[in-house]
């Protein structure tokens, strides 16, 4: 817990270079996001193919889309689970972080020192061991979140499910109901290849209880589509006299000495005539 | 027929609880979440929350956090609203209601028959 | 919370009117649904997305409206139309109805 309220930011006087002043964590053992460069990461061949259980969610059933004041993030249903851990991990909310308009890099974890355009995260927690998201934060092995790097690229109907509301989750507070959809449709082609390491949430308190799971391939949306991310909510209550927009809501890469990510691929991405295999 | 039948309404003290159940038929009850609405009398709707019987998870109106549980049994197909620290004001018809996604939204296409609550010394 | 004012609260109107009842959100709204209720009895779905009848529902009705402004018209009123309609809205939380409004014979 935060040694004086719970007041933090991306950025001016409670930006990230604060946040362990009321968060000791923010400055301790294995934060995140990283880097990811070549040389830390090492093959693992136990690395085995996650299975993604009731992630097909009813349109039939409603999901709250929330302003949060940091993110927009959509609450989970606890029987949506990763199968393939050595827990059962449930599903309890997604959320993004991004850019701005003017320099749309806002994913969290970078490659080889390059950001993309914007990042989702699907946050689990571990079911077998605990009984809720907030009980399992502060837990050893408590956290599992997948990670998904967003470019800009062609139009993708399955964000757009999140995005078309948007408007109704303007202001910090503010909730909106989204019918269910095929959350697997978020993630990118071949989720067998990732990247696995221990690190910490990205938002204070920053607890060093996550296992990271970074799919390889990115998934594209378009220009319009990232713009409207950028460009449509705000931190503030609607009723704040000095609304600041929620853009740049990405923490810096962190500190990762002397440790290794390991990747479920060995291979390298070879150029081909059709890009990039 | 789908049916959701609601019981359990009657005279209840002020400051005391209340436990409303609605059972539902004729459809697969784990494939459409449960609501709960109320109506004072000669007033208009007025909604609760709701649960997700596939897994028990529950969102409320915010006025009634805290003090409205909603919970479910499986095995009975059977849904229930706990009210505590009851006041006069709570005094309503209590309807349970099934929403349906049709065309792009969902629209409450079942209603129970509702069961009312009187909050009297 | 998105409020929803309904008008008028009540109506007089006879038989073979046109009847015009108005739902303004606080807020804009991707959809409004109608539903109506008769004493005593629990509230039917009548209109859902601004403007499809729910089956069985008279084509003298229609539903229009986008953003905040929303209507439900009745073409021509038949006896059985008399009753209480509320406007509905699931676009935020919480979802909210407006109050009412009652037809009644003049």
């Known amino acids: 817990a935060p040694v004086n309220g719970s007041k933090w930011t991306y950025f001016g006087p409670d930006g990230e270079n604060s946040w362990s002043k009321k968060y000791p964590s923010c400055g301790g053992l294995l934060q995140s996001p990283i880097d990811l460069h070549s040389d830390i990461l090492q093959y693992d061949a136990s690395l085995t193919p996650l299975e993604f259980q009731g992630y097909n969610l009813s349109a039939n059933k409603q999901f709250l889309l929330t302003n949060n004041g940091h993110s927009v993030k959509l609450n989970l249903p606890s029987d949506m689970h990763i199968q393939g851990l050595q827990s059962r991990y449930s599903a309890t909310q997604l959320h993004l972080h991004w850019g701005n308009p003017n320099d749309p890099h806002g994913s969290e974890h970078t490659v080889s020192g390059q950001h993309f355009a914007a990042e989702l995260h699907i946050v689990h927690y571990n079911s077998d061991l605990y009984p809720d998201a907030s009980t399992a934060s502060n837990k050893s092995e408590g956290l599992a979140v997948l990670a998904v790097l967003i470019e800009m690229g062609s139009f993708n109907p399955s964000y757009d499910k999140i995005f078309s509301h948007l408007q109704h989750v303007k202001y910090k507070g503010q909730e909106a109901f989204v019918p269910g959809f095929n959350i697997e449709e978020l993630l990118p082609e071949r989720t067998a290849e990732y990247y696995r390491y221990r690190g910490s949430l990205t938002t204070p308190p920053c607890n060093p209880t996550v296992l990271w799971t970074v799919f390889r391939n990115p998934v594209q949306i378009s220009q319009e589509q990232l713009l409207a991310l950028e460009t449509a909510l705000y931190c503030t209550h609607m009723d704040d006299p000095s609304p600041r927009e929620m853009i740049n809501n990405f923490r810096q890469v962190q500190k990762f000495d002397e440790r290794l990510v390991y990747t479920s691929f060995s291979q390298v991405q070879v150029c081909t005539a059709a890009g990039l295999s | 027929e789908v049916q959701l039948v609601e019981s359990g309404g009657g005279l209840v003290q002020p400051g005391g609880s209340l436990r409303l159940s609605c059972a539902a038929s004729?459809?697969?009850?784990?494939?459409?979440?449960i609501y709960w609405v109320r109506q004072a009398p000669g007033k208009g709707l007025e909604w609760v929350g709701y649960i997700d019987p596939a897994n028990g998870d529950t969102t409320y109106n915010q006025k009634f956090k805290g003090r409205a549980t909603i919970s479910v049994d499986k095995s009975k197909n059977t849904a229930y609203l706990q009210m505590n620290s009851l006041r006069a004001e709570d005094t309503a018809v209590y309807y349970c209601?099934?929403?349906?996604?049709?065309?792009?939204?969902?629209?409450?296409?079942?209603w129970g028959q509702g069961t009312l609550v009187t909050v009297s010394s | 919370d998105i409020q929803m004012t309904q008008s008028p609260s009540s109506l007089s109107a006879s038989v073979g009117d046109r009847v015009t009842i108005t739902c303004r959100a606080s807020s804009s709204v991707t959809y409004m649904h109608w539903y109506q209720q008769k004493p005593g009895k629990a509230p039917k779905p009548w209109i859902y997305r601004t403007s499809d009848l729910i089956s069985g529902v008279p084509s003298r009705f229609s539903g229009s409206g986008s953003g905040t402004d929303f209507t439900l018209t009745i073409s021509s009123l038949q006896p059985e139309d008399f009753a209480t309609y509320y406007c509905?809205?699931?676009?935020?939380?919480?979802?909210?109805f407006g109050q009412g409004t009652k037809v009644e014979i003049k």
């Open positions: 209601s099934r929403p349906i996604y049709y065309g792009a939204y969902w629209y409450f296409d079942v």
């Open positions: 004729g459809y697969s009850y784990t494939d459409y979440n």
């Open positions: 509905q809205q699931w676009s935020s939380n919480p979802l909210t």
